[in-house]
């Protein structure tokens, strides 16, 4: 009689991520007695996947009943598969012996390759905001996904960015790879409703890449212009000037009033108006009373914005001529200031 | 007291590179940008570029196109501006500034670097 | 970018006299103007930022005016020791630029 052989008819067997992995094995002859294992790998450090005389695999079955004399099919499925059970798997007969059992024959393995989906990418940007005109980086992650090939893209409010470097590890043989990009994203000053796309295409993922984003609201920071100037008067000896403090961003906002370098009013911004472009408008007014000075008065609008040394505007108010002389004007002389509050 | 203190004068042969340093003192280094600004011998002043090292964001004047790296050194406080295939215009004093884009102009000036280029 | 188009190239004036460097901007820069004082050897010395804002410890005798593309310099009464070049510089839009110069002599 022809001696046994152990037959595995896939060389490879490709399966996603958490489906059922079915590994073939039979044998042409019953003899000799003895049972069928299961390894992941050869030689001496490999695994044991399944074995029919003993043990506890909880996530192994059979293809078929392995306790009836005639069976010649050990067949094996592995459930929930992960990367992690990437690699060649061998079926092997054992013949009976005392006390042990003996090696037999080895089929030739079958290869098991595990396809799994990336991670949702995951893109940050700098840790400190920037401003409009400054090239920043962005980087994008994403993790666990087999095979190797993956494509990654970035994107700027759907315009395609060509700035960018990408790496994928480990670059030799591995279970399961990572993919690490840098992004560099000119800022403007109209990018506060901008968002930085991170797309990443697979082969698992049918044709439906993941994304992941940033919005530019949580790095740029889009310094205000200032601009001082007198009202027409209120009354007989009132003078009411005005600070418009033009397209900022985020919102946080101090405003101080000087009257001749001193502090007269402090106040955060609250009801600012918002523009198209996601950047912020406000206003600050001050009512001078200018029977209560002799001298002309310096009036200075300082502002300090999201944490950055304070900038400030000044405006000479002349108390010789009448108030109602001075009417608007609407050109502010922006006269020498020292408010300077550096950190 | 704000300083910036600059490395000191180099002599390069066209084609080559230099990297000028700039080490900073007396301030939160991550909190303003360091902005390069050159001279040429008897000439008026030229923006190279800057970068804030609180964000890593660069802008660089593109007349260089390409030629000018900059970096910064949180841990020693240092920004530093390579030129590189260098040619003998590039011959000038190289300067290091303080600013806080968009608030303030340049408010604090390093030394000067001179970099002669000349085979 | 931005032409920074300053005048006059230099000029002579007297001790105590007022004088007066203009800069014209080829397209708007709100209020960002900057002018800078340099003596030779040395490194430029901020003076004006904001168009009219006086930086710390400069005397009062330096003032800037202006907005939109057309800014003035001023010095009310010449000193001896404001004999150097002065420079206007934008920095509303990168890169940022400097005027050609102003070269101050006494006469």
């Known amino acids: 009689e022809e001696e046994l052989q152990v037959i595995q008819p896939d060389k490879s067997v490709l399966v996603a991520a958490g489906e059922t992995a079915t590994l073939r094995c039979t044998a042409t002859s019953l003899i000799p007695v003895g049972p069928i294992q299961w390894f992941r790998g050869a030689g001496p450090g490999r695994e044991l996947i399944y074995n029919q005389k003993e043990g506890h695999f909880p996530r192994v079955t059979t293809v078929s009943d392995l306790t009836k004399r005639n069976n010649m099919d050990f067949s094996i499925r592995i459930g929930n598969i992960t990367p992690a059970d990437a690699g060649t798997y061998y079926c092997v007969k054992f013949r009976k012996g005392s006390p042990d059992d003996v090696e037999f024959k080895s089929g030739a393995g079958t290869e098991l390759s595990v396809r799994a989906k990336p991670s949702a990418p995951v893109v940050s940007g700098p840790a400190a905001r920037a401003t409009p005109q400054h090239t920043v980086s962005f980087t994008c992650e994403s993790h666990g996904f087999s095979p190797r090939d993956i494509t990654l893209k970035w994107f700027k409010n759907g315009n395609e960015l060509s700035d960018f470097q990408t790496n994928v590890d480990p670059v030799g043989e591995s279970v399961s790879y990572s993919i690490h990009s840098t992004a560099k994203v000119v800022l403007t000053r109209e990018d506060v409703h901008s968002q930085v796309i991170c797309e990443v295409a697979h082969v698992t993922l049918q044709g439906d890449p993941l994304r992941g984003t940033a919005n530019l609201s949580e790095t740029i920071r889009v310094p205000p212009t200032l601009e001082v100037t007198q009202q027409p008067v209120r009354a007989e000896n009132q003078v009411n000037v005005t600070c418009q403090v033009r397209k900022f961003y985020p919102q946080r906002l101090q405003l101080t009033w000087l009257e001749n370098g001193n502090v007269s009013r402090t106040e955060t911004a609250s009801t600012v108006t918002e523009n198209k472009d996601g950047t912020y408008n406000w206003m600050s007014w001050l009512l001078v009373n200018v029977s209560a000075h002799r001298d002309d008065v310096k009036l200075t609008c300082q502002v300090e914005h999201d944490g950055q040394p304070a900038v400030s505007k000044s405006h000479d108010l002349k108390v010789s001529a009448h108030p109602k002389e001075q009417g608007s004007n609407t050109a502010a002389e922006n006269t020498g200031s020292n408010e300077r509050n550096i950190y | 007291q704000v300083q910036l203190v600059q490395s000191g004068a180099e002599v390069k042969k066209p084609g080559s590179s230099v990297k000028v340093s700039c080490k900073a003192s007396g301030y939160t280094f991550t909190d303003y940008e360091i902005h390069w600004v050159r001279q040429a011998p008897g000439q008026g002043l030229e923006w190279m570029g800057d970068i804030h090292p609180g964000s890593g964001g660069t802008a660089n004047n593109q007349k260089f196109k390409g030629r000018v790296t900059i970096t910064a050194d949180e841990s020693t406080s240092t920004a530093y501006m390579e030129l590189s295939s260098l040619r003998s215009e590039d011959t000038a004093v190289y300067y290091c500034a303080r600013a806080v884009s968009g608030y303030y102009a340049m408010d604090y000036w390093g030394q000067g670097t001179l970099v002669t280029v000349s085979s | 970018d931005i032409q920074m188009t300053q005048s006059p190239s230099s000029l002579s004036a007297s001790v105590g006299d007022r004088v007066t460097i203009t800069c014209k901007a080829s397209?708007?820069?709100?209020?960002?103007v900057a002018w800078y004082q340099q003596k030779p050897g040395k490194a430029p010395k901020l003076l004006i930022y904001?168009?009219?804002s006086l930086e710390t410890g400069v005397p009062s005798r330096f003032s800037g005016s202006g907005s939109g593309t057309d800014f003035t310099f001023t010095i009310s009464s010449l000193q001896p020791e404001d004999i150097a070049t002065y420079y206007c510089?934008?920095?509303?839009?990168?890169?940022?630029?400097f005027g050609g110069g102003t070269k101050v002599e006494i006469k």
């Open positions: 510089q934008q920095y509303w839009t990168t890169p940022w630029t």
């Open positions: 904001g168009t009219a």
């Open positions: 397209e708007d820069i709100y209020d960002r």
